[in-house]
């Protein structure tokens, strides 16, 4: 027997359905209606013959008090090829839930979204990640999307983005987003983040991540974070192959002072970078290939320091810093 | 049989951040359900504080949220609670818990916010 | 945010009696075929314990005398023949929407 496609745990919390049949019944997702968080993976399967079987310009409005009546506040959906339509009338319906947070994943979306009619409720999320998401309207996808929800988002994860860069006159400004997470996107670059990095649509963020997204320095980093005028609180470079030095050449870029924490960890280096901030709060250069401990004129005024795993250090080495805070211990790095 | 412990100091003064972890054994945070944190000021009725859910997502209640955050380490298989700027009303027995319906609770732990 | 208001807020009764215990919503618990609403026993210095989940479904351990009943905003806990060791506060709360929210409990008493 095959088992069943979802599974709803003892508590209502948690729904997960994976539909891998060729023509899946997909009432058997209607357990899912009292689940507080949902995962629907669909299994590759192409969603266009659904617009033959609902009305995507309806009024969803009909269907308020049903879906006001779903607990769901998080909702992933996965491995699906999307005609945009429908994708817009999911959204023009979840709008009346309480979804808070929408995960997209391993989907293609096909055709172009419709405007917002000027009756329709945009959906109030407080948080959007999307991971290997393609979008048949290469770089507008953002502003497209966009428009289907309220201004009050506040997390932002783009990964494996086949289109990164945003048409940045379409998009609007995100007064609300304090998280922008453009990690797991190798190609980026730093180029790219300047394109991504749309100049005075993010003037809230206070924590960026660019894990794995191709950085090669810090000053790279810096000069495209000046260029948008963002400026985080908090930055993520950890797990980029990053140069120590600076092309000297290159313009010395100021880093705003409102960035309190770096994280270099997982880099590659060999000697701590030029060009760091003067003063943080915290600084992990772990996991690193330092072969000697950093001298202070090295180092930012730094009050939360971590070393962990570089090959000078060994267990019982005295602490390099005044206020590190390394273990003694080699992590696994 | 699961179970949840909580650890931290039991007197914070005004205006600091009270901070409490609780350790949970025969279960995994990370896997299922909804960690809360739940309170108890003393001689009065019971308060959800938030939750960090398996997949990490959290919820808090509007009361508190712009003072509180909940954490987790799942190496550790522990998750936390910030309280920023408490006063005296915050003192109470703090209570962690899993699930929508408070299934399993610790045993709690009194925190007292005086100078 | 969903109030939850108990009644009586206190009652002494004797060993061997009825006694019921009724919690009113401000709003729905209900979603879909679902009653989020659970009831709690709790005794001096000790965590609360979970008698009746979803309205009417008895916590396992919990002894049989002990069941619920109710559907959108109006709930019962009903101890079909009171025990000593049922000397507690009691507490209904609601998990069908957060924030999370408890009634102000109903203290009970031995006559």
């Known amino acids: 027997t095959t088992p069943e496609p979802c599974e709803l745990d003892d508590e209502d919390f948690r729904c997960v359905c994976n539909f891998s049949e060729p023509q899946p019944d997909w009432s058997e997702a209607f357990q899912c209606v009292s689940a507080v968080e949902v995962e629907i993976h669909a299994g590759g399967l192409n969603l266009e013959p659904f617009l033959k079987r609902v009305d995507a310009d309806a009024d969803p409005r009909q269907y308020a008090d049903t879906v006001k009546a779903l607990r769901v506040r998080r909702l992933t959906v996965g491995a699906a090829q999307v005609p945009a339509q429908l994708l817009v009338g999911a959204l023009r319906v979840l709008a009346y839930s309480r979804l808070k947070e929408l995960t997209l994943e391993d989907l293609k979306i096909t055709g172009t979204m419709p405007p917002l009619p000027l009756e329709a409720t945009g959906l109030a999320l407080s948080s959007l990640r999307l991971r290997n998401v393609s979008w048949a309207t290469g770089r507008s996808w953002l502003a497209e999307l966009q428009q289907w929800l309220k201004p009050g988002l506040k997390v932002l994860s783009i990964a494996q983005a086949h289109s990164p860069a945003f048409s940045c006159e379409q998009v609007r400004a995100f007064p609300a987003l304090t998280s922008l997470d453009l990690s797991d996107n190798p190609g980026l670059g730093e180029r790219g983040l300047m394109a991504a990095l749309c100049p005075h649509k993010f003037p809230a963020i206070q924590n960026l991540a660019l894990r794995n997204t191709g950085m090669e320095t810090p000053t790279g980093v810096c000069a495209a974070l000046a260029a948008a005028g963002v400026q985080p609180h908090s930055l993520d470079l950890s797990h980029n192959s990053l140069r120590a030095t600076v092309n000297p050449s290159a313009p010395r870029c100021m880093w705003s002072s409102a960035l309190n924490s770096l994280n270099l960890s997982f880099a590659g280096l060999e000697q701590v970078p030029k060009g760091l901030p003067a003063k943080l709060r915290v600084l992990d250069l772990s996991c690193n290939r330092l072969n000697r401990a950093p001298q202070p004129d090295e180092l930012p005024e730094v009050d939360n320091l971590t070393l962990d795993g570089n090959p000078f250090l060994v267990p019982g080495t005295a602490l390099p810093h005044e206020g590190s805070m390394n273990s003694g211990v080699v992590p696994a790095c | 049989q699961l179970q949840l412990q909580e650890s931290g100091p039991g007197l914070v003064k005004p205006s600091e951040t009270l901070s409490l972890t609780c350790t949970v054994s025969?279960?995994?945070?990370?896997?299922?359900?909804?960690w809360n944190w739940i309170r108890q000021p003393p001689g009065k009725g019971l308060e959800w504080i938030g939750y960090?859910?398996?997949?990490?997502?959290?919820s808090y209640n509007p009361s508190l949220k712009s003072r509180v955050t909940i954490s987790r380490d799942t190496s550790k298989n522990q998750f936390s609670l910030k309280l920023s700027s408490v006063t005296a009303a915050d003192t109470a027995v703090y209570y962690c818990?899993?699930?929508?319906?408070?299934?399993?609770w610790g045993q709690g732990t009194l925190v007292t916010v005086s100078s | 945010d969903i109030q939850l208001t108990q009644s009586p807020s206190s009652l002494s009764a004797s060993v061997g009696d009825r006694v019921t215990i009724t919690c009113r919503a401000s709003?729905?618990?209900?979603?879909?075929?679902?009653?989020?609403l659970h009831w709690y026993q709790q005794k001096p210095g000790k965590a609360p314990k979970l008698l009746i989940y979803?309205?009417?479904n008895l916590q396992s351990g919990v002894p049989s005398r002990f069941s619920g009943s109710g559907s959108r905003t109006d709930f019962t806990l009903t101890i079909s023949s009171l025990q000593p060791e049922d000397v507690a506060t009691y507490y209904c709360?609601?998990?069908?929407?957060?924030?999370?929210?408890f009634g102000q409990g109903t203290k009970l008493e031995i006559k």
């Open positions: 818990v899993r699930g929508l319906r408070f299934a399993y």
């Open positions: 025969g279960g995994s945070i990370s896997s299922d359900s909804a």
């Open positions: 960090i859910s398996y997949s990490g997502s959290t």
């Open positions: 709003e729905s618990v209900d979603s879909y075929v679902n009653s989020f």
């Open positions: 979803r309205a009417s």
């Open positions: 709360q609601q998990s069908n929407e957060d924030p999370y929210t």
